[in-house]
C-alpha cells in the first residue's frame, strides 16, 4: 500500500513542496515519485519513506508516489493547487470629468490568479462596493453602470480582487486597480452672457463681462475671453454656481475693423461658447479751420469743417450743403465777431450707432478804440463836495489804455470815488489807445456851488 | 547503502588554503544536496553552506562568504569545499552532510588545522 | 539570522529516567526543527526531522514536539547508549543554525 503526505496542498506559484511518499512493506523493490517538476530527495535512512522537494511548481500538478512490494504496485496521488493573485487587476480608461445625470460604465479587467474558485472581482466606490461577482473568464470581466450624481464629485472608484484562500488555511490575498477619480460636472446648456460695447473707438478701453451660472463645480470653470486674436485676462468672480470674468479690452488702428469677441466657457469636457461682433472705429474730432484766428474788423474770415470722410457734418448747427463731411461760411469779421466761437459737430454711423464728435475754435477780432457818448458821457454836472465817480468806458480789442487830461497833466479819476471840488472843473481830453489806433474825446465837469441864503 | 567518505586531516598554515573532498556512495549527487557543518573543538556544530549538485548553486553562510567554494563533481559523484585565507579559528572538524533541509547521513569529518 | 537556544546545557540523569530537552528559536520557524545526536568523536546522526517526524531505524524512545519558537526533544526511558550531546538545528531561513547543544551526562 503507498501512502502520500500530504495528500492536498495549496501553494504560491513558483513554490517548492515537500511530498513524502510512504510504503507499508519493509521492502520495497521500488519507492519513487513520479512528476514533471524539478525534485530533490531528501535522503532519509531507512526504504519505506522517502521526501521530495518538488520545486518551481507553476501550475496545478499531481504527483504520483509509486511503490512496488512483493504483494504487487500500488500508487497514490497528492493534490498541489497553485495560487497567485492576479497580474492585472485594472479599470478600463474613462474620461476623469463626466456630466451629472450621465450613466457611466465602470468595467474592471483581471488578467490571471489562481484558483478562480477563490477569486472574487469587487467594484467600489470609495469603500462602497457597487458590484460583486467571481472571476470568469481570461481576462475576467466585471461592470457596472452608475448614474453620476453631483455628490460623486472626487469620489475614487476602483477594482479589487480577493483571492480568499482562508478555507484552505492562508489568508485573503486582496489587489486593487489604481483609483479613477470622477470629476463629476455640470455646465448649463445656455451659453454665457456677455456683455461688451458693440463699438470701440481705436486707442481707448473697453470693459467685456462674461458670466454664467448654474455650473458645478464653478471653481473649476474656465473662462477663455478673446478679441480677435487678443487673448483678455479677465478678473474673474466666483459665486455659489456661477462666475462673472470682467477683463479691459485696449484697441489700436491695427484692430480697425469687425473683430469677433468671444467668451469660451469649458467645464469638464465640454464647452459653450458665445460669439459677439465689435466693430473697431478711428473717428478723429472733426477740424474747424479759420482764415486766421485772429483778424481785424471787416476782414473777409472762412470757416471751414472737415471731418471724417464717411461722417456728416453741421457747422454752427447748420448742415453741410450737401450733407457730407466737410463745411464751410464766410463772413465780415465785426467788432460783434469777437470771441465767437464757431462749433462744429460730426457724425458718424458705426454699426448702426451714431457717433458724436465735436470741435470749436473762437475768433479774435482786433477793432476798436472806441470812446461814444454811452459810455463816456460828455458833460457832468456835479454839485460841490458831492461824492462822484467819474465814468468812461473805452471799447476795443485789444482794450484800449484810457487816459483823461485837463490841460494835458490833470487827471480825471476814471472809476474812482472822489469828493467834488472846484478844482475838478473843467474840459478834460480822454484818449483811448491801443495797437489798433487812438481816438480822444472832450468831457467836460460842471461843478455847481452851494447856495447860502 | 548510503555513505560519505571524506579526505584525511590537513594542517595548513594561517593564510593558506584547504580543499576536503567528500566522495558519495549509494545514491546520486545530483538528487539532493550536500550540506558542510564544521565543529571546532569542543564546541557546537556550525553550518558552512550548502551546494546542489545538479545546477552548482550555492548558499554560503554570511560569516564565511568570500573565502568558501563549494563545487561537485557529478562524474565521480564528488563534493568539494575549498576554505582559502584560513585563520587559526578555522581550526575545526569538517563534515559533508547529504539531504536537504536536515542532515541524515554524514561523512566521517575531516580535521582542518590551521597553525603557524 | 535566527538565534537557537537550547537549555538545559547540561544535564545527569539515570538509565530509564524521562529526559526532556528544549529548543527555542529567535523567531517563529513553523515545524522546520531536526534533531541531532552526536557521541565523542563521531559525526552527528539524525534523530527527529521536522519537529516530530521520526526516523527509521532509531528507537521509538526518542520523540519530537513543537511548532513555532518551542520544541521537545523527549527520551522517554533514558539507556546507556544515549549518554551524548543533542542538538537542535533550524531549516526556516539561511544560514541554517544549530542550538548550542544540551550534554546528557551520567548521573
Known amino acids: 500500500q503507498t501512502s502520500v503526505s500530504p495528500s492536498k496542498v495549496i501553494l504560491p506559484r513558483g513554490g517548492s513542496v515537500l511530498v513524502t511518499c510512504s510504503t507499508s512493506c519493509d521492502q520495497p523493490k521500488l519507492l519513487g515519485i513520479e512528476t514533471p517538476l524539478p525534485k530533490k530527495e531528501l535522503l532519509l535512512p531507512g526504504n519505506n519513506r522517502k521526501v521530495y522537494e518538488l520545486s518551481n511548481v507553476q501550475e496545478d500538478s499531481q504527483p504520483m508516489c509509486y511503490s512496488n512490494c512483493p504483494d504487487g504496485q500500488s500508487t497514490a496521488k497528492t493534490f498541489l493547487t497553485v495560487y497567485w493573485t492576479p497580474e492585472r487587476v485594472e479599470l478600463a480608461p474613462l474620461p476623469s470629468w463626466q456630466p451629472v445625470g450621465k450613466n457611466l460604465t465602470l468595467r474592471c479587467q483581471v488578467e490571471g490568479g489562481a484558483p478562480r474558485a477563490n477569486l472574487t472581482v469587487v467594484l467600489l466606490r470609495g469603500e462602497k462596493e457597487l458590484k460583486r461577482e467571481p472571476a470568469v473568464g481570461e481576462p475576467a470581466e466585471v461592470t457596472t453602470t452608475v448614474l453620476v450624481r453631483r455628490d460623486h464629485h472626487g469620489a475614487n472608484f476602483s477594482c479589487r480582487t480577493e483571492l480568499d484562500l482562508r478555507p484552505q488555511g492562508l489568508e485573503l490575498f486582496e489587489n486593487t486597480s489604481a483609483p479613477y477619480q470622477l470629476q463629476t460636472f455640470v455646465l448649463p446648456a445656455t451659453p454665457p452672457q456677455l456683455v461688451s460695447p458693440r463699438v470701440l473707438e481705436v486707442d481707448t478701453q473697453g470693459t467685456v463681462v462674461c458670466s454664467l451660472d448654474g455650473l458645478f463645480p464653478v471653481s473649476e470653470a474656465q473662462v477663455h475671453l478673446a478679441l480677435g486674436d487678443q487673448r483678455l485676462n479677465p478678473t474673474v468672480t466666483y459665486g455659489n454656481d456661477s462666475f462673472s470674468a470682467k477683463a479691459s479690452v485696449s484697441v489700436t488702428a491695427e484692430d480697425e475693423g469687425t473683430q469677433r469677441l468671444t467668451c469660451a466657457v469649458i467645464l469638464g469636457n465640454q464647452s459653450q461658447e458665445t460669439l459677439q461682433t465689435v466693430t473697431i472705429y478711428s473717428f478723429p474730432a472733426p477740424n474747424v479751420i479759420l482764415t486766421k484766428p485772429e483778424v481785424s474788423e471787416g476782414t473777409e474770415v472762412t470757416v471751414k469743417c472737415e471731418a471724417h470722410p464717411r461722417a456728416k457734418v453741421t457747422l454752427n448747427g447748420v448742415p453741410a450743403q450737401p450733407l457730407g463731411p466737410r463745411a464751410q461760411l464766410l463772413l465780415k469779421a465785426t467788432p460783434e465777431d469777437n470771441g465767437r466761437s464757431f462749433s462744429c459737430s460730426a457724425t458718424l454711423e458705426v454699426a448702426g450707432q451714431l457717433i458724436h464728435k465735436n470741435q470749436t475754435r473762437e475768433l479774435r477780432v482786433l477793432y476798436g478804440p472806441r470812446l461814444d457818448e454811452r459810455d463816456c458821457p460828455g458833460n457832468w454836472t456835479w454839485p460841490e463836495n458831492s461824492q462822484q465817480t467819474p465814468m468812461c468806458q473805452a471799447w476795443g480789442n485789444p482794450l484800449p489804455e484810457l487816459k483823461c487830461l485837463k490841460d494835458g497833466t490833470f487827471p480825471l479819476p476814471i472809476g474812482e470815488s472822489v469828493t467834488v471840488t472846484r478844482d475838478l472843473e473843467g474840459t478834460y481830453l480822454c484818449r483811448a489807445r491801443s495797437t489798433q489806433g487812438e481816438v480822444t474825446r472832450k468831457v467836460t465837469v460842471n461843478v455847481l456851488s452851494p447856495r447860502y441864503e | 547503502q548510503v555513505q560519505l567518505v571524506q579526505s584525511g586531516a590537513e594542517v595548513k598554515k594561517p593564510g593558506a588554503s584547504v580543499k576536503v573532498s567528500c566522495k558519495a556512495s549509494?545514491?546520486?549527487?545530483?538528487?539532493?544536496?550536500i550540506h558542510w557543518v564544521r565543529q571546532a573543538p569542543g564546541q557546537g556544530l556550525e553550518w558552512v553552506g550548502r551546494i546542489d549538485p545538479a545546477n552548482d548553486n550555492t548558499i554560503y553562510d554570511p560569516k564565511v562568504q568570500g573565502r568558501v567554494t563549494m563545487t561537485a563533481d557529478t562524474s565521480t559523484n564528488t563534493a568539494y569545499m575549498e576554505l582559502s585565507s584560513l585563520r587559526s579559528e578555522d581550526t575545526a572538524v569538517y563534515y559533508c552532510?547529504?539531504?536537504?533541509?536536515?542532515?541524515?547521513?554524514w561523512g566521517q569529518g575531516t580535521l582542518v588545522t590551521v597553525s603557524s | 539570522d535566527i538565534q537557537m537556544t537550547q537549555s538545559p546545557s547540561s544535564l545527569s540523569a539515570s538509565v530509564g529516567d524521562r529526559v526532556t530537552i528544549t529548543c527555542r528559536a529567535s523567531?517563529?520557524?513553523?515545524?522546520?526543527l531536526h534533531w541531532y545526536q552526536q557521541k565523542p568523536g563521531k559525526a552527528p546522526k539524525l534523530l527527529i526531522y521536522?519537529?516530530?517526524q521520526s526516523i527509521s531505524g532509531v528507537p521509538s524512545r526518542f520523540s519530537g514536539s513543537g511548532s513555532g519558537t518551542d520544541f521537545t526533544l523527549t527520551i522517554s526511558s533514558l539507556q546507556p547508549e544515549d549518554f551524548a550531546t543533542y542538538y537542535c538545528?533550524?531549516?526556516?531561513?539561511?544560514?541554517?543554525?544549530f542550538g548550542q547543544g544540551t550534554k546528557v551526562e551520567i548521573k
Open positions: 552532510a547529504a539531504s536537504g533541509y536536515w542532515f541524515a547521513y
Open positions: 549509494g545514491f546520486n549527487i545530483k538528487d539532493t544536496y
Open positions: 523567531q517563529s520557524i513553523s515545524n522546520n
Open positions: 538545528q533550524q531549516s526556516n531561513s539561511w544560514p541554517y543554525t
Open positions: 521536522h519537529a516530530s
